[in-house]
Every structure is written in C-alpha cells, then in structure tokens.
C-alpha cells in the first residue's frame, strides 16, 4: 500500500502505525486497534477509524426534509467489529452480549437484542444528508459559489467523485449536502459516501483525520465558512426495523 516513502507516514489516516516492512522495503501502514493494513492513497473505512479511535487514549479526541426512515447516529461511539475489508459487520455486540444490526456506516438500524439476534446482510446506506448551520456572516453566500466549493472540497479533500454529490441546498444559515451512492453506482476504487461523510464530520469538528494536512479551511469567494452545528441523516436501501415503541417515543 502506498504511503509517503521518505518519512513513512499515512497522509490519509493519522491513526496508523507505519514502517518500511512492506514488499521491497516499501512503507506499510496499519490501523491502530485492528492492525489491518490500510491504503494510504484513499480514505480509510469508517469502521477501522472508529476501532482506532476506541483504542486510542481517551484524551486524544430548497431544503430537504429527511425521510421518516432517516437514521441519526444517536448511539455515539462504540468499538465495532470490522470484516477483513474493513467494513462494518452487519451484527455488532457489546461486552455484555447486547447485539444490534447496523448499516454500512455503522449506525444502528434495529432494536437491541441478545446473541440470538440475526442480521442477514449489511444494508447499504445509499443516501446521506449532511445538515449544516453556518455562523452569521455579513450576507448570504452565493448559492452557486457555495455549491461549487463544496463539490470541489469533496472531490479534492475526500476524493469523492462529484457524481456522488447529488445536491447542495442553501437557505441561510442552513446548508444541506446530499450524497447519493447506490451499490450499482459504486465502482472499484470509488470512495464510499459513508467514509467521506465521516471524514467531513471530523473535519468540521476540528478533529481532522489527515496526517500533516492542514485543518479544514473552507472559503467561498474568500469568505470563511464556519460551521456551528452539524446533523447527519442516513437513509438505507432497505428501511430500518425498529419496534413501534421506539417509533412513538
């Protein structure tokens, strides 16, 4: 896997340990927590990043209406089980044998159960709605300039092809970025929208996952775009399965 040859670091993931022990003395980087080799020319999967985060010392840390099936990550951090490709396993369990099913971005999509709970497949999150509120500015941003800059950001910083940025909506001070990526659309080598959204979320929080690269400095025509609130909604190809008790709560 590629990494900076000279100082042997991983530009796309600072939560790695790198050493020149790859074939021919090439730099190879492994994710903290899992020890899995990562490809440093692209984003690391969210599952491996969450696992690394949980293993790290604790101090290292026209608007669209979301569909009724949209999920929000209310459960927060957990130590996930990842498959050999670094994807979330469909079933996640904690140390007390409480289990639940997750989607491809690792967000719970069923009620919690016990070890008998079955999660037949990893359901793909095909639509992500990133809802941002920006800090007050002298005037509203120009919508087309904002759209262009956000598309460029996802392309250049997160290597997400612009075709997966379905739309950028803006009603000051709310910005919504829609990412869409069906299973059939995602080709080998394409960055997953879930991984791009996670890197973006961490960037917005000032917790960049990139090694040596500056923090996120988002500007529209030279004017800084500073985000004060972020909410992310996840829509799966198959609607989630929660009991009526939760739905009416």
């Amino acid at each position: 896997h590629t990494a900076a040859q000279d100082n042997c670091t991983c530009p796309t993931n600072k939560m790695t340990v790198c050493s020149p022990d790859g074939p021919g003395g090439r730099c190879q980087c492994r994710a903290l927590g899992s020890g899995m080799a990562v490809d440093c020319s692209t984003l690391t999967s969210k599952c491996l990043l969450l696992k690394a985060r949980m293993s790290a010392p604790k101090n290292a840390r026209t608007l669209v209406r979301p569909s009724e099936h949209a999920l929000v990550d209310n459960d927060g951090l957990y130590d996930p089980d990842c498959d050999p490709e670094g994807r979330f396993k469909a079933r996640q369990c904690n140390q007390t044998s409480v289990c639940w099913c997750v989607n491809s971005v690792g967000v719970r999509r069923t009620d919690k159960g016990d070890l008998s709970l079955r999660c037949d497949e990893l359901v793909r999150t095909h639509h992500i709605l990133i809802d941002l509120r920006h800090r007050p500015t002298a005037g509203a941003f120009n919508h087309s300039d904002l759209d262009a800059e956000l598309r460029r950001l996802f392309r250049e910083r997160y290597r997400l092809h612009p075709k997966f940025v379905a739309a950028v909506h803006y009603e000051q001070p709310t910005i919504q970025i829609e990412l869409r990526q069906n299973t059939s659309q995602k080709a080998a080598g394409d960055v997953d929208i879930g991984d791009a959204a996670y890197y973006f979320e961490r960037d917005i929080k000032g917790e960049s996952l990139f090694q040596g690269r500056g923090g996120l400095d988002l500007r529209v025509r030279g004017e800084p775009l500073q985000v004060e609130r972020t909410l992310i909604y996840y829509l799966d190809e198959i609607p989630p399965k929660f009991s009526m008790k939760r739905l009416t709560a």
């Epitope: 598309r151 460029r152 612009p162």
Partner: antibody
C-alpha cells in the same frame, strides 16, 4: 470517443470569441471538461473547467472574469472569451478527465487556433 | 500549487536515459500526471497517480515520487520519444494560476 474544438479565428484586440467543444461517443455527464491553451512555442496553460452534471465551474486566477465556461447542450461545452489581447493568441484545447475524482486528462481534442491581431 | 519542471531541454542518444524533474510548491499527495506532446498534436497522458502507466504506454516510461518531488524517467530512448513532456498536478483546481509544469523538450540524437 472523441472531442473536437471549433470557433478559432483571427480577431481584433478587444474582441470577444466563443469556442465550442463537441463530445462524441460518450456521455458528458459524470466528467469534467477542462480548457487548456498553448501559445505558439510555449507550454500548456490551464484556463478553467466545468463539472458537467453539477454545472460547477472553476477558473485559473488569471482567467476569472474574462473567460466563461458553460454546457450548451448534451454534447457541447463552450468557452467564451472577452477583451482579447495579443497575449491570448494560442491553440485552445478542450480535454476530459478520466472519470475519477482526480483531474487526469485522458482525452483531448486536436485544438483550435485563436489569433488576436490588428 | 506552482509546478516547476527541470530541465527545460535535454538531449540524449538513442538507447540512453532521460530523467525529468517536477517540483510542486506544496504537497500534492502523488496526484501527478505526465504528458507527452509532439508538434501539431494535443498532449497524450502517459502516467497518472505519479507512477501508474496509462494503458498502451511502454514500460520504458517510469514515474516516481511523493510529497512535492516527482520524476519521469525514460530509458532505452527511441527516436519516437522525441517530444515535449509536461507534468500536471491533478490535486486541486482551486486558487491556482496553472496546473502544468513549464515543459521539458527531449531531443533524441
């Protein structure tokens, strides 16, 4: 798959000109089209680009304000140039990215010559 | 993200080796391409991602580098390799003057 530029001409200083890039054999959507120029005996100079599906446009710092790229049909992209000077004399190429998130240009048109002279 | 390419011109005999250097003003994370251009023709993509060979390009062309420093090496030079070669940073199109290096003319004696 091919690209072809047209509209190159001999024009007076201060004039405006519109160049057209026509795509054949592939769907323009999901690609970016970039305009690059080359003055006689000089190197390549990036002018700007458009991401077709989203319509977003981007320009080199020196090209902002005087050059405008737009998609005019399902197969054509134009480059509008205003206030032309002798320094704009060049062969103008349109090129397509490779369909990835990077800007590697794997398909080029043959170019069209623009001469600005009185 | 200025791209500085050296040398401006180089001359080598058939069978020789040429190395062209390209330096970016900032880290471009291996997002670099090399193009070959012959007189009267548009540029042709040779190498992308700093070291990956475009389909149909002979393995005599070798790209390497990371960070800000990149090289293109052409070994076993052939007469057909006489051309001008350009590097291009493929990382960003934001707030730049040009994404291409100044070019290197390769003369094959």
């Amino acid at each position: 798959q091919s690209l072809e530029e047209s509209g190159g001409d001999l024009v007076q200083p201060g004039a405006s000109l519109t160049l057209t890039c026509k795509a054949s054999g592939f769907d323009l959507n999901n690609y970016s089209i970039l305009w690059v120029r080359q003055a006689p005996g000089k190197g390549l100079e990036w002018i700007g680009s458009i991401y077709i599906s989203g319509g977003s446009t981007y320009y080199a710092n020196w090209a902002k304000g005087r050059f405008a790229i737009s998609k005019t049909s399902s197969t054509t992209v134009t480059l509008q140039m205003t206030s032309l000077t002798a320094a704009d004399t060049a062969t103008y190429f349109c090129a397509r990215d490779d369909g990835t998130a990077s800007y590697y240009l794997n398909l080029w048109g043959p170019g069209t010559l623009v001469t600005v002279s009185s | 993200y200025d791209m500085t390419q050296t040398p401006a011109s180089v001359s080598e005999p058939v069978g020789g080796t040429v190395t062209i250097k390209c330096q970016a003003s900032e880290d471009i994370y291996k997002l670099l391409a090399w193009y070959q251009q012959k007189p009267g023709q548009p540029p042709k993509l040779l190498i992308y991602a700093a070291s990956d060979l475009e389909s149909g390009v002979p393995s005599r062309f070798k790209g390497r580098g990371s960070g800000t420093d990149y090289t293109l090496t052409i070994s076993d030079l052939e007469a057909a390799d006489a051309a001008t070669y350009y590097c291009q940073q493929a990382y960003t199109i934001g707030n730049i003057d040009n994404s291409f290096g100044g070019g290197t003319e390769v003369v094959v004696k």
